[in-house]
């Protein structure tokens, strides 16, 4: 059974992930550049189901394209370079989902824009955090 300290650690990691995802979303929403149109044309894969930490595998697999889409911005809207930002997120995701379990992600049929994609994972973090508090 999870201890109170491990639950607290998980909660803090989820809050950190949530803040990173919100920062990216805010950066995109405040971003005015010809490349924004191009960024919004990229279709991200969404999880068929996202209710447990193991489902973060679906986020992990989309982090590379997310980085490359964000790279288009070449913007000061993010405090960190996309590479560093995504690297930070990747570390958190790996810790949260655990690397010892091999979970095959199942994707939904519909794809999503970067904004819809980020909102989906922000909702996921908020949902899990609410079950921990």
């Amino acid at each position: 059974a999870p201890t109170s300290s491990s639950t607290k650690k998980t909660q803090l990691q989820l809050e950190h992930l949530l803040l990173d995802l919100q920062m990216i979303l805010n950066g995109i929403n405040n971003y005015k550049n010809p490349k924004l149109t191009r960024m919004l044309t990229f279709k991200f894969y969404m999880p068929k189901k996202a209710t447990e930490l193991k489902h973060l595998q679906c986020l992990e697999e989309e982090l590379k394209p997310l980085e490359e889409v964000l790279n288009l911005a070449q913007s000061k809207n993010f405090h960190l370079r996309p590479r560093d930002l995504i690297s930070n997120i990747n570390v958190i995701v790996l810790e949260l989902k655990g690397s010892e379990t091999t979970f095959m992600c199942e994707y939904a049929d519909e794809t999503a824009t970067i904004v819809e994609f980020l909102n989906r994972w922000i909702t996921f973090c908020q949902s899990i955090i609410s079950t921990l508090t």
Partner: antibody
Framework: QVQLVQSGAEVKKPGASVKVSCKAS????????INWVRQATGQGLEWMGW????????GYAQKFQGRVTMTRNTSISTAYMELSSLRSEDTAVYYC???????????WGQGTLVTVSS | DIQMTQSPSSLSASVGDRVTITCRAS??????LGWYQQKPGKAPKRLIY???SLQSGVPSRFSGSGSGTEFTLTISSLQPEDFATYYC?????????FGQGTKVEIK
């Protein structure tokens, strides 16, 4: 990490067929198209076509239409490129590379040398 | 088919030189262009995508510019490991087409 591993070198006679494989790992195979690009010795790169592993849909450069077939086996995350009616001009290194929308040819296989000689 | 004309076909340069390679498309391709580096016996490696975006892990001395029909790859200060052949690729429409390549040699 993402890897595309291709089958070994082949020597074929003119008129024969060759089938090159490309095994993907480190990502969800059905999320990215597989493209095939060839390069004759000392020459430039030539795009041959694409295959969507999810649907099996394909698109070939006109030059190879009727001679090339691109297929896949999703259960083993492997794509195949078969070229028939081989001639000496088909002697080249054949590469597979993945793409997704406008993120194109970001990872490549190591290449497979196909030699056509009588 | 869209023709991609690369120039020069080869060039000799010294370490530390600024090198510029140009790619011209036979019709407008927006920014649907990538730049690739290839060393002998190796698979090509993507340097630049969508005309100007630097591939993660690629040194910042590489940069891409242009849109429409005129594109440029610039190496701000050539390093020993940069001696290779460079190709542009258009991917706005099928069939995708590469430039004929630019071989960068040591002077």
């Amino acid at each position: 990490q993402v890897q595309l591993v291709q089958s070994g070198a082949e020597v074929k006679k003119p008129g024969a067929s060759v089938k090159v494989s490309c095994k993907a790992s480190g990502y969800t195979f059905t999320n990215y198209d597989i493209n095939w690009v060839r390069q004759a010795t000392g020459q430039g790169l030539e795009w041959m076509g694409w295959m969507n592993p999810n649907s099996g849909n394909t698109g070939y450069a006109q030059k190879f239409q009727g001679r090339v077939t691109m297929t896949r086996n999703t259960s083993i995350s492997t794509a195949y490129m078969e070229l028939s009616s081989l001639r000496s001009e088909d002697t080249a290194v054949y590469y597979c590379a993945r793409s997704r929308q406008w993120l194109v040819l970001d990872y490549w296989g190591q290449g497979t040398l196909v030699t056509v000689s009588s | 088919d869209i023709q991609m004309t690369q120039s020069p076909s080869s060039l000799s340069a010294s370490v530390g030189d600024r090198v510029t390679i140009t790619c011209r498309a036979s019709q407008g391709i927006r920014d649907d262009l990538g730049w690739y580096q290839q060393k002998p016996g190796k698979a090509p490696k993507r340097l630049i995508y969508i005309a100007t975006s630097l591939q993660s892990g690629v040194p910042s001395r590489f940069s891409g510019s242009g849109s429409g029909t005129e594109f440029t790859l610039t190496i701000s200060s050539l390093q020993p490991e940069d001696f290779a052949t460079y190709y542009c690729l258009q991917h706005i429409s099928y069939p995708w087409t590469f430039g004929q390549g630019t071989k960068v040699e040591i002077k």
